[in-house]
């Protein structure tokens, strides 16, 4: 899977994680920090 960094406009999109762009799927994706979940890593689950 080809990935790259999200565009600058997506800075802040992932609240507790890193935004990556999945080139082959044409999708932005939040890779959440441990303990966080949700589309934008907005939920703390521990």
């Amino acid at each position: 899977v080809s990935i790259t960094k999200c565009n600058s406009d997506m800075n802040g999109y992932c609240l507790h994680g890193q935004c990556i762009y999945l080139v082959d799927m044409s999708q932005n994706y939040c890779r959440c920090e441990v303990g966080y979940t949700g589309v934008r890593c907005e939920h703390f689950y521990l």
């Epitope: 600058s8 609240l15 080139v23 044409s26 589309v39 907005e42």
Partner: antibody
Framework: QDQLVQSGAEVKKPGASVKVSCKAS????????IQWVRQAPGQGLEWMGR????????KYREKFEGRVTITADTSTNTAYMELSSLRSEDTAVYYC?????????WGQGTLVTVSS | DIQMTQSPSSLSASVGDRVTITCRAS??????IAWYQQKPGQAPRLLIQ???TLQPGVPSRFSGSGSGTDYTFTISSLQPEDIATYYC????????FGGGTKVEIK
Amino acid sequence: QDQLVQSGAEVKKPGASVKVSCKASGFNIKDTYIQWVRQAPGQGLEWMGRIDPLRRQTKYREKFEGRVTITADTSTNTAYMELSSLRSEDTAVYYCVRSGREFDYWGQGTLVTVSS
Amino acid sequence: DIQMTQSPSSLSASVGDRVTITCRASQDIHKYIAWYQQKPGQAPRLLIQYTSTLQPGVPSRFSGSGSGTDYTFTISSLQPEDIATYYCLQYEQLRTFGGGTKVEIK
């Protein structure tokens, strides 16, 4: 399926304000940014600004700063764009556009006519 | 703000011709450019995103390329149904549209 349904056409007098709504269904606007784009008759596309409904943060194109207000009501899954001090040059179709995880998905557009 | 300079503003070509439209950004946009087609009375239709990724259902005669500040959109063999106005959009930093290119048949 995902949808953005905008409010109906408006006719306003110069100097008045207009508020256009954009109701989302099939997805949560908190997972997205909502952008607003307009197109005057026979003219090109013009980005106006956007809101991050989760953080309640807005960014506006400089030329609209102070005249446009973009808001979002996450309880009703609806975004709004209010433009004040209307002039004839603001006659245009106004589009809301979802961005975020996937690339842009557009509403059907709302025609705003400014005429005395 | 990033500026997008699109050229030409209009062009006339024959059916079967190769058509090329260019957009130049005022700074590096890291391939974050999309191309839209708009026909009169219709909302814009997304053709390409991330420089060269064709949207599902878009004919393969449409393509995009480029990097840094210079980007190209190509119709390899112009068809009558391609008559429309085409816009580039940078989405690296907020959003800026190019001025549009009106494509007509000779």
